[in-house]
């Protein structure tokens, strides 16, 4: 015997209170498949969530995140704060990179500046919260007469005390 509810299309539900006739889903609800006995409540995109696609009788609303946040999880289950360059995301929100570290992206963690001296090079441009140091030629390469450019004072590098 065929289930009479199987005739109910998406956007409707099989109404047990009305002799199993197909009733339309009321506003703010949906059924995305036929034969359903209830309509599901539409997702509400509130707070840091923003409506990407409105809910209809046959499909749920889809959310994304307001500027400054990005989606995490299936169907944008959560919005994660985007940090600025020079910051990293901690459990307490966005925090500036500690001295000696940098982050040149809006995601990820702060990373230590390159230790130029490990490669036998000198610091050409000091590091910042947003940018790594730029290593230049080794001090030996900068013998008198080899360059008319005076190198900047070396930046303090993590794990190294000033010479």
């Amino acid at each position: 015997l065929q289930d009479p509810c199987s005739n109910c299309p998406a956007g409707t539900f099989c109404d047990n209170n009305r002799n199993q006739i197909c009733s339309p889903c009321p506003p703010n609800s949906f059924s995305s498949a036929g034969g359903q006995r209830t309509c599901d409540i539409c997702r509400q995109c509130k707070g840091v969530f923003r409506t990407r696609k409105e809910c209809s009788s046959t499909s749920n609303a889809e959310c994304d995140c307001v500027p400054g946040f990005r989606c995490l999880g299936a169907g944008c289950a959560m919005c994660e704060e985007y940090c600025q360059q020079g910051q990293e995301l901690t459990q307490k929100g966005c925090k500036d990179c500690c001295f000696g570290t940098f982050n040149d992206q809006k995601r990820g963690i702060c990373r230590p500046w390159t230790n130029c001296s490990l490669d036998g090079k000198s610091v050409l441009v000091n590091g910042t919260k947003e940018r790594d140091v730029v290593c230049g030629p080794s001090p030996a390469d900068l013998s008198p007469g080899a360059s008319s450019v005076t190198p900047p004072a070396p930046a303090r590098e993590p794990g190294h005390s000033p010479q």
Epitope: T12, P27, E54
Partner: antibody, heavy 117, light 112 residues
Framework: QSVEESGGRLVTPGTPLTLTCTVS????????MIWVRQAPGKGLEWIGV?????YISHATWVKGRFTISKTSTTVGLEITSPTTEDTATYFC??????????????WGQGTLVTVSS | DIVMTQTPASVEAAVGGTVTIKCQAS??????LAWYQQKPGQPPKLLIY???TLASGVSSRFKGSGSGTEFTLTISDLESADAATYYC??????????????FGGGTEVVVK
């Protein structure tokens, strides 16, 4: 794509009247349709809506004075017991999409209903 | 029910001027608000939806803003063709009262 209202005429108070909104170029199973009226020299007043899935919702003030119906190509509005206050131009309009929170971007020219004894 | 209150009822401005129309909702409707223009003997014409998105073919002189309960329609560089009555309408289907297509009372714009 178009919507067109018809059925407006002079009626006496208490005589039921049914207005028809005929659509062409699109399917009523994809769009919501609303009825809106405008009394002479007055503002727009929302009467009710029929959604793509057939769900019908009336404005609270309607209280049984109007009944909305739907076929595959028409949407009906019955004025169950007209009074002189129901004298107005009645507009039918189509939604922009099939979502619950939609707006209305395709309107008919309206049909005039005059209720007078 | 959601009640939409529009102010002013009428406003007069010169060609080239700017007009601002306000619309207030009795409860928060997020950005579910549309603006319509209506000229005598014609049906309403959609100008703006989702509070600030310009409808197709509408001049960028029309600007909508606001969210929650307070909304504004601004018409800049007024032209004589802008003389009309303007209505706000909520399209927030699913409020607590499930009555979400109410119109404001309208604002008549007179262009001198």
């Amino acid at each position: 794509q178009s919507v067109e209202e018809s059925g407006g005429r002079l009626v006496t108070p208490g005589t039921p009247l049914t207005l028809t909104c005929t659509v062409s170029g699109f399917s009523l199973s994809t769009y919501a349709m609303i009825w809106v009226r405008q009394a002479p020299g007055k503002g727009l007043e929302w009467i009710g809506v029929v959604y793509d899935n057939g769900y019908i919702s009336h404005a609270t003030w309607v209280k049984g004075r109007f009944t909305i119906s739907k076929t595959s190509t028409t949407v009906g509005l019955e004025i169950t017991s007209p009074t002189t206050e129901d004298t107005a131009t009645y507009f039918c309009a189509r939604s922009a999409d099939g979502s619950w929170s939609t707006y209305f971007n395709l309107w008919g020219q309206g049909t005039l209903v005059t209720v007078s004894s | 029910d959601i009640v939409m209150t529009q102010t002013p009822a009428s406003v007069e401005a010169a060609v080239g001027g700017t007009v601002t129309i306000k619309c207030q909702a009795s409860e928060s409707i997020s950005n579910y608000l549309a603006w319509y223009q209506q000229k005598p003997g014609q049906p309403p014409k959609l100008l703006i939806y989702k509070a600030s998105t310009l409808a197709s073919g509408v001049s960028s002189r029309f600007k909508g803003s606001g969210s929650g309960t307070e909304f504004t329609l601004t018409i800049s560089d007024l032209e004589s063709a802008d003389a009309a009555t303007y209505y706000c309408q909520t399209n927030y289907c699913c409020s607590s009262s499930d009555n979400g297509f109410a119109f404001g009372g309208g604002t008549e714009v007179v262009v001198k």
